[in-house]
């Protein structure tokens, strides 16, 4: 990872951690993520259909960045959400959200990022996802659009 | 630090941590950082010519914020990168990046920040740096422009 | 929390952590926060009159996001600060700050977030607060505006 092999595993319990990067074949919501190649990390957490699946209850720092850009600004409202789903609960819970309106000059080529990060108490079997309002405006470069967490 | 002396060192192994703040005599890339005065932290990590040098392989949360501003907006494309260099590898690896285009109204005084933060698996001897596209547009106040990490 | 009860307390020492969310009855600075309901966390740290009160010296990752929005853009300068106060020191210390100027098109409905996050060495009895320049432009939804920290 990051251009060199992972360090040998230590004897102590593995850190629960994930860092997933943008995957350009996302076609619908939630966003899908690269979980294998490049600067990706996935340890003690599972990745399933766009979601990070918690397998140990506890406190986690969860973060995501999304890079929006377009050829010709028309100021479509942009939103970027990290939300949680659990089969025991009927509704998605929005944990963090960023919104942008009136952020560029009409007609111009434009680019802007949204960053979210905070601590949450997560329970085993919680599924975490990222949602955006305008998929066609997302650039999926691994350094620009990502989703991760680690257990405190 | 933060206006009061550091706490007495604990017996247990020191936490690997850094928080460096903007240094206005940066003249070229990568950005240089204040590593001594103010709200700076540097423990178990070395600072060398703009870079944070990892001396223990492991998982790190790495972050940076850059505050861009100008007297008269001309919408120059802005970029803010955290990248990694290691003598074993020929090329810099961009870990995180933020880009901005069409972000202010021509002619106006303007100000905007870029924030990056994520988890990476770093190896001893990795050097981490911050790069920006327009040095003259960066304000280096310690509360506004910074670069840090800590070992999980 | 996050739609399900907290896990049973473990025997080991409780993690010092806080995640407070926007409270719309903030009337003046510093911002006030929801410390009880919703996705709030408060453990090993006290909340008092808008502030997080540190009760154990050490290294903390501190973060905040503020969601600004308005009906009709007039590009009022926006600022978002995390600052520290301690009775031993005469002056507030600004730890992190974000500023925005010329960020929307005059007359349009607009929305924008500011995110801050970094590591600091905090001392017992330090009080941490969040300040914004334009209270009337803040939206206090729990997913949009928040303030938190955790001890490394």
């Amino acid at each position: 990872q990051i251009g060199h092999p992972s360090p040998p595993p230590e004897k102590k319990e593995l850190r629960k951690v994930a860092h997933l990067t943008g995957k350009s074949n996302s076609r619908s919501m939630p966003l899908e993520w690269e979980d294998t190649y490049g600067i990706v990390l996935l340890s003690g957490v599972k990745y399933k259909k766009g979601g990070l699946v918690i397998n140990e209850t506890g406190l986690y720092f969860v973060y995501s960045k999304v890079y929006f850009r377009g050829q010709s600004c028309n100021n479509l409202p942009l939103s970027h959400k990290v939300y949680m789903r659990n089969s025991k609960y009927p509704q998605d819970l929005v944990m963090m959200e960023g919104k942008m309106m009136s952020y560029c000059t009409t007609g111009q080529m434009w680019a802007r990022s949204s960053y979210l990060g905070a601590v949450f108490n997560l329970t085993s079997a919680d599924h975490l996802y990222v949602n955006v309002s305008e998929l066609s405006l997302v650039n999926f470069e691994e350094s620009q659009t990502f989703f991760g967490l680690y257990k405190l | 630090q933060i206006g009061h002396p550091s706490p007495p060192p604990e017996k247990k192994e020191l936490r690997k941590v850094a928080h460096l703040t903007g240094k206005s005599n940066s003249r070229s890339m990568p950005l240089e950082w204040e590593d001594t005065y103010g709200i700076v932290l540097l423990s178990g990590v070395k600072y060398k010519k703009g870079g944070l040098v990892i001396n223990e392989t492991g998982l790190y949360f790495v972050y940076s914020k850059v505050y861009f501003r100008g007297q008269s907006c001309n919408n120059l494309p802005l970029s803010h990168k955290v990248y990694m260099r290691n003598s074993k590898y020929p090329q810099d690896l961009v870990m995180m990046e933020g880009k901005m285009m069409s972000y202010c109204t021509t002619g106006q005084m303007w100000a905007r920040s870029s924030y990056l933060g994520a988890v990476f698996n770093l190896t001893s001897a990795d050097h981490l740096y911050v790069n920006v596209s327009e040095l003259s547009l960066v304000n280096f106040e310690e509360s506004q422009t910074f670069f840090g990490l800590y070992k999980l | 929390q996050i739609g399900h009860p907290s896990p049973p307390p473990e025997k080991k020492e409780l993690r010092k952590v806080a995640h407070l969310t926007g409270k719309s009855n903030s009337r003046s600075m510093p911002l006030e926060w929801e410390d009880t309901y919703g996705i709030v966390l408060l453990s090993g740290v006290k909340y008092k009159k808008g502030g997080l009160v540190i009760n154990e010296t050490g290294l903390y990752f501190v973060y905040s996001k503020v969601y600004f929005r308005g009906q009709s853009c007039n590009n009022l300068p926006l600022s978002h600060k995390v600052y520290m106060r301690n009775s031993k020191y005469p002056q507030d210390l600004v730890m992190m700050e974000g500023k925005m100027m010329s960020y929307c098109t005059t007359g349009q409905m607009w929305a924008r977030s500011s995110y801050l996050g970094a590591v600091f060495n905090l001392t017992s009895a330090d009080h941490l607060y969040v300040n914004v320049s334009e209270l009337s432009l803040v939206n206090f939804e729990e997913s949009q505006t928040f303030f938190g920290l955790y001890k490394l």
Partner: antibody
Framework: QVQLVESGGGVVQPGRSLRLSCAAS????????IHWVRQAPGKGLEWVAV????????FYADSVKGRFTISRDNSKNTLYLQMNSLRAEDTAVYYC????????????WGQGTLVTVSS | DIQMTQSPSTLSASVGDRVTITCRAS??????LAWYQQKPGKAPKLLIY???SLESGVPSRFSGSGSGTEFTLTISSLQPDDFATYYC????????FGQGTRLEIK
Amino acid sequence: QVQLVESGGGVVQPGRSLRLSCAASGFTFSTYGIHWVRQAPGKGLEWVAVIWYDGSDKFYADSVKGRFTISRDNSKNTLYLQMNSLRAEDTAVYYCARDRDNWNYFDYWGQGTLVTVSS
Amino acid sequence: DIQMTQSPSTLSASVGDRVTITCRASQSISSWLAWYQQKPGKAPKLLIYQASSLESGVPSRFSGSGSGTEFTLTISSLQPDDFATYYCQQYNSYITFGQGTRLEIK
């Protein structure tokens, strides 16, 4: 009503220093950027420097960069211009002027103070 | 740097005349132009901003037009109080003033 009143001008030798002040009243000083603009005798207007509403950022004309320093004290509603290493070509009437909504044009001006640099 | 060139440098006119002052920018400045009036021994006074917007309190006989590189200030019917020097100023890229146009009594 909005008022800007400059002071501190006078005759000074080349290489010496001078500090100008601009006292503001009639508006919320701490929410406006303020500029210095100068006018050499019988000549046109030349922009000199600006300081942002909170004092966080300052910008200068190339002709004065490194020699002049703009500052403000929002608690005193006062703007300053510290002029060092003065030259004959700095001789001018110096005006402070209020910025209009961060747009780099000027809706209110002071009456000016004359600085003469001469040996 | 953007250069601003005013013409004419001096203009002689009579009360009641319609007068036009021109300001040219060395490159396009969109509509980011202001006009000021200055009387001897006094500070400049803002008349027009954003090329054509009349500042509050300024008589309606003053008007501005133009965009890109060519701008005009027009006084529809000269009054005795209007004899002064007029400056254009661009704020598209930093700040530069024209050299001024002196409007004198014919």
